[in-house]
């Protein structure tokens, strides 16, 4: 709404607020080594960091959630940092007949917001 | 993926895991009393509760986030409880010419999942 203004500058200091971060993970870490063949190591972009009042609010719901959290912190949780979009990834799979390629549209985050 | 099985039973006990909860809020609570006329009190459905491993996972990203949180809890946050869908709400607005109705598609949560 025009009466609620989400903001993009982090009041907590650099790197503290909701942002995208790359985490290295092996197929073993993910428990996928029995059915995914490649890549053996994945660069997984994930959303991490805090969501202070009005920071990168996803929508009207997130804005009012932030406001109500300020009023009733025990009752209403603060918004949290989650993916706003994803980037597709292609994996090589083990199949009965050999190897196949499969795309995942919801595996690696591309952007983050506070919801 | 067929190799990852999100679950719907809460291992923490009744009401502890991610679910929809109704929160009463006045226009004053929301800071909307200067421009919204009605309703004066809103029943806001919000997503609250914890997201233990594999509980109501939103997608593949949430499943691997849960797994990596178990391996690197300081680096990777646990999934958190956010709206999976919304229900539209109509508000009566004050305008320069009088009163108008406006629909908000993203104000009240209808369902929740762990993202």
């Amino acid at each position: 709404s025009a009466h609620l203004h989400p903001r993009d500058s982090c009041p907590l200091g650099p790197g503290r607020c909701c942002h995208l971060e790359t985490v290295q993970a092996t197929l073993e870490d993910l428990g996928w080594s029995d059915w995914v063949l490649s890549p053996r190591q994945l660069q997984l972009s994930m959303c991490v960091g805090e969501c202070p009042h009005l920071y990168r609010s996803a929508n009207t719901h997130a804005l009012i959630k932030a406001r109500l959290h300020g009023l009733q912190p025990d009752r209403v949780p603060a918004p949290c940092c989650v993916p706003s979009s994803y980037t597709p990834v292609v994996l090589m799979h083990r199949t009965d007949s050999g190897v196949s390629l499969q795309t995942y549209d919801d595996l690696v985050a591309q952007g983050c917001h506070c919801a | 993926s067929a190799h990852l099985h999100p679950r719907d039973s809460c291992p923490l006990g009744p009401g502890r895991c991610c679910h929809l909860e109704t929160v009463q809020a006045t226009l004053e609570d929301l800071g909307w009393s200067d421009w919204v006329l009605s309703p004066r009190q809103l029943q806001l459905s919000m997503c609250v509760g914890e997201c233990p491993h594999l509980y109501r996972s939103a997608n593949t990203h949430a499943l691997i986030k849960a797994r990596l949180h178990g391996l690197q809890p300081d680096r990777v946050p646990a999934p958190c409880c956010v709206p999976s869908s919304y229900t539209p709400v109509v508000l009566m607005h004050r305008t320069d010419s009088g009163v108008s109705l406006q629909t908000y598609d993203d104000l009240v949560a209808q369902g929740c999942h762990c993202a």
Epitope: L37, S38, P39, R40, Q41, Q43, T87, P88, V89, V90, L91, M92, V99, L101, T103, D105, V108 | -
Partner: antibody, heavy 119, light 110 residues
Framework: EVQLVQSGAEVKKPGESLKISCKGS????????IGWVRQMPGKGLEWMGV????????IYSPSFQGQVTISADKSISTAYLQWSSLKASDTAMYYC????????????WGQGTLVTVSS | QSVLTQPPSVSGAPGQRVTISCSGS????????VNWYQQLPGTAPKLLIY???NRPSGVPDRFSGSKSGTSASLAITGLQAEDEADYYC??????????FGGGTKLTVLG
Amino acid sequence: EVQLVQSGAEVKKPGESLKISCKGSGYSFTSYWIGWVRQMPGKGLEWMGVIDPDGSYTIYSPSFQGQVTISADKSISTAYLQWSSLKASDTAMYYCARYGRYGTYFDYWGQGTLVTVSS
Amino acid sequence: QSVLTQPPSVSGAPGQRVTISCSGSSSNIGVLYVNWYQQLPGTAPKLLIYSNDNRPSGVPDRFSGSKSGTSASLAITGLQAEDEADYYCQSWDSSSNYVFGGGTKLTVLG
């Protein structure tokens, strides 16, 4: 600097065998897939297949399955494309290309190897 | 016959804006990103746009990509003589994996 350097042009007769190469440098060769792309004279690009140089897993386009073999030797950072019995219709420019991080596009290309098959 | 359909040729005068379309289906462009490659005469293809609208470093901002539904397009503004090349779109198809458009020859007039 990322580079893919391909072997030189080849002139062959129908029925002969051939193996062309693509050497990667300037990056971790085993961390990125390598694809092969054909371009027949005056025509467009056709994806032939892909190899993971780390585990040597290969996947072929249905159009090229059984027609060519893709392989790699990670000890010398080189991928290969080979034919056991060439046909005149194999005359084309062949490119190797490195896949981007998530395997959805080709971010670096070799200069191409022209293969001419004629009796 | 390419899975992705491009016009065989487009042309424009220096300084003009041209667009190249790439039409697919719900099994390719409809579900995955589109990438664009430029092939200058006698050279290897070069990545121009990836993931619908991202430019690799070194690609001028005169080049931009977009996607809507099962179609994508490449726009070139401030056309220059050195933009004369073949342009290919590429996506993923559930049946044949990586697919290219048939290519579009861009001619810079004058």
